[in-house]
Structure formats: C-alpha cells, structure tokens
C-alpha cells in the first residue's frame, strides 16, 4: 500500500477520505487505527457502527469521528481540533471477523496555524528516517467548528 499524506492546520479540523470498492467490502464494518511504530500494531482509534446498515451514522471517540458511505465506497474520518500529537501514520481498515484489511495508509501532517505566532518547533514532520518516497499528498481544506455548532446529531 502506498501512503497518502493529509495535511491539516493545528486547531482546525482535518478530513481524511479512504475510497474503497463497495462490493468487495460489502457488509464489513470499518475502522481507523494509529500505527505504533513502523512494524508495530495498529491501535484502534474509532470504528463504524456495530450494525453495518447504520455505518452512515457518525461515531466519535474523543476528537475523532468516522462515517461510512457504504454505497459510494468512501470512509471518512474527521480529526477535530487538530493537535501536533495527532501527527503520524494511520490506517483505514475493513473488518471481517477478527481480521482487518488495510484500505489505505495515511500520514497525517500537522501544519502551524499561520495566525498563531507561537513557536512551531513542536509541530511534527516526517524525519529523514521516515521518508515516504511514493506518498501522495492531499491538502485538506478544513475549518474550525463554529461556536455553538454541534459536532453530532442530538440523541432525542
């Protein structure tokens, strides 16, 4: 799998999309996980609804949301209020039983907020030891949530 780079601005929301063959993965739940080291396990961050038919409902874990367009074949992950520690390598996964197929490898890069004049020294970029030669960069145009905006539908 090639790695796709998504760049977002600190403090804003970053949307990551993972396209897939909807027939190949029909009926399968999806997940977003964070790669722990180059060869380490992929630690689950959030997964789609337990009932596959309800995969379109947005599920949150902390500041990370996931939703699945099972007909169109696009998994969408939203990282809200992006922080430097969110930078790193992730995977979109398709689940079947206890197995997980990788849909896409994603490198999240966090860029300094141009309006924030604090020291950007703690922002993460891949170092020389983490070169992604065939990485494809996607700039995600995102915005911060407006004041009072509800990030998920009310439960009533």
């Amino acid at each position: 799998h090639n790695t796709t780079v998504f760049q977002g601005v600190a403090g804003q929301s970053l949307q990551v999309s993972c396209p897939y063959d909807s027939m190949k993965h029909w009926g399968r739940r999806k997940a977003w996980c964070r790669q722990l080291g180059e060869k380490g396990p992929c630690q689950r961050v959030v997964s789609t609804h337990n009932l596959w038919l309800l995969s379109f409902l947005r599920r949150w874990n902390g500041s990370t949301a996931i939703t699945d367009d099972t007909l169109g074949g696009t998994l969408t992950i939203t990282l809200r209020n992006l922080q430097p520690h969110d930078a790193g390598l992730y995977q979109c996964q398709s689940l079947h039983g206890s197995e997980a197929d990788t849909l896409r490898k994603v490198l999240v890069e966090v860029l300094a907020d141009p309006l924030d004049h604090r020291d950007a020294g703690d922002l993460w970029f891949p170092g020389e030891s983490e070169s992604f030669e065939d990485a494809h960069v996607e700039h995600s145009i995102s915005r911060s949530l407006l004041e009072g905006e509800i990030p998920f539908p009310p439960t009533s």
Epitope: D21, K24, W26, R28, G97
Partner: antibody, heavy 118, light 113 residues
Framework: EVQLVQSGSEVKKPGESLRISCKGS????????LAWVRQMPGKGLEWMGI????????RYSPSFQGQVTISADKSISTAYLQWSSLKASDTAMYYC???????????WGQGTLVTVSS | DIVMTQTPLSLPVTPGETASISCRSS????????????LDWYLQKPGQSPQLLIY???YRASGVPDRFSGSGSGTDFTLKISRVEAEDVGVYYC?????????FGGGTKVEIK
C-alpha cells in the same frame, strides 16, 4: 441464474503441471469473492484460499501457500487453481465457491476431480 | 488455526424426529464488538457439492426450510433439524470464519434408520 461451471476431471502423473478452471455466469464476476475448497477422497472440506477478481486480491490458507496458485481473468469471468508440480497427495475433488465479503459461500461449482497417479 | 470438532461422527435418525449435531471450536467465534458469531453450517448431499444452510450462527440461507436452525454461543454450537425428512441425508459441516484460515469441522453423516 448464478452458475459456477468447473472444468472436467483430470488424470495426471506426479511432477506434471495442471490448471483447473471455474467459470462464473449470471452475476458480475468481478464483484464477488471466489474461493477454492479441497475434498480428499472420503474426507472433509478444506479451505485453500480466496480471490477477489476485481483487483486479484488473493488470500491463501497457510497449508496451501506456495503449493498452489489462485488467479482470475475477469475478462472471461473465470477463476483458476494451478499446480506447477503435482503430487499423489493432490488427488482430490476441488470445488470453487462464490463468497460474500464476510466469507460465507452461497454458490458452489460442481467440482473437478483431480487424480494424480504414476 | 482454529480447530472445529463435530459430534457425533454418524447420526442415524428416524423420519419425523429431531436431529441435533454439535460443533465445538478451539476458541471463541464471537466478535465482541459487533456481537456476531462467525459460524456457518453446510450440507453435502450424496454425490453433490456442499450447500449453505446457516450463516452467522442462526441465519437461514435463501431457500432453506425453517426445519433447520442454528444456535450456540462462544465455542459450543448446535444445528437442529426438526421433522427430519429423507432428503436431509448427507454430511453436515460447521465452518468458522472469524479468522483466517477458515476451517471446517470433520463432518457429521446423517442417515435414515
């Protein structure tokens, strides 16, 4: 009507190569997983592996990895099971089966009997 | 690999009676997250290819009579055939698909007394 039609019986000698086929019809061949299952004489079923013809994504059971090759040609809606050097222990009935993405098998071919004997 | 063990090996039944086949897995087939149990049942009638009877523990495949039912939890499973008919004879296999490689039980041969 969904159909999986397998190639006819084969009698081969040890060391020979062989490719058997499974032709799908009545559905979009590219869009469904297709598995191969072995049944040795008088024995049970063994899952060999599975392929998604749309992109040729293939998974093998460790017991069969390196022993056989699973492939598909979506242009002619046909999947293949291939041996480069047959052994007497390869004598069996081989079934192809159409799977869902969750890997249960709703349609089966009629089977191909492979006999390997010197 | 997950080992699937079926009992009995052979089951003689009288038409109209209920037959029960057991299947045990070496580890749990329950996905605790989605609540599904990844256990299926297949029937291979004499001289025929296998056919799907039950998938995901208890869902009947299309065209399968309601005389067939699957149940169980975790590692112990049962296929029940109520009001057994002559056409039900054959070898019944359980199969797990919670992890690769998919594995089948050794089979239970159902025959009419």
């Amino acid at each position: 009507e969904v159909q999986l039609v397998q190639s006819g019986s084969e009698v081969k000698k040890p060391g020979e190569s062989l490719r058997i086929s499974c032709k799908g019809s009545g559905y979009s061949f590219s869009s469904y997983w297709l598995a191969w299952v072995r049944q040795m004489p008088g024995k049970g079923l063994e899952w060999m592996g599975i392929i998604y013809p749309g992109d040729s994504d293939t998974r093998y059971s460790p017991s069969f990895q390196g022993q056989v090759t699973i492939s598909a040609d979506k242009s002619i809606s046909t999947a293949y099971l291939q041996w480069s050097s047959l052994k007497a222990s390869d004598t069996a009935m081989y079934y192809c089966a159409r799977g869902t993405p969750l890997f249960y098998f709703t349609y089966w071919g009629q089977g191909t009997l492979v006999t390997v004997s010197s | 690999d997950i080992v699937m063990t079926q009992t009995p090996l052979s089951l003689p039944v009288t038409p109209g009676e209920t037959a029960s086949i057991s299947c045990r897995s070496s580890q749990s087939l329950l996905d605790s997250e989605d609540g599904n149990t990844y256990l299926d049942w297949y029937l291979q009638k004499p001289g025929q290819s296998p056919q799907l009877l039950i998938y995901t523990l208890s869902y009947r495949a299309s065209g399968v009579p309601d005389r067939f039912s699957g149940s169980g939890s975790g590692t112990d499973f049962t296929l029940k055939i109520s009001r057994v008919e002559a056409e039900d004879v054959g070898v019944y296999y359980c199969m797990q698909r919670i992890e690769s490689p998919l594995t089948f039980g050794g089979g239970t041969k159902v025959e009419i007394k």
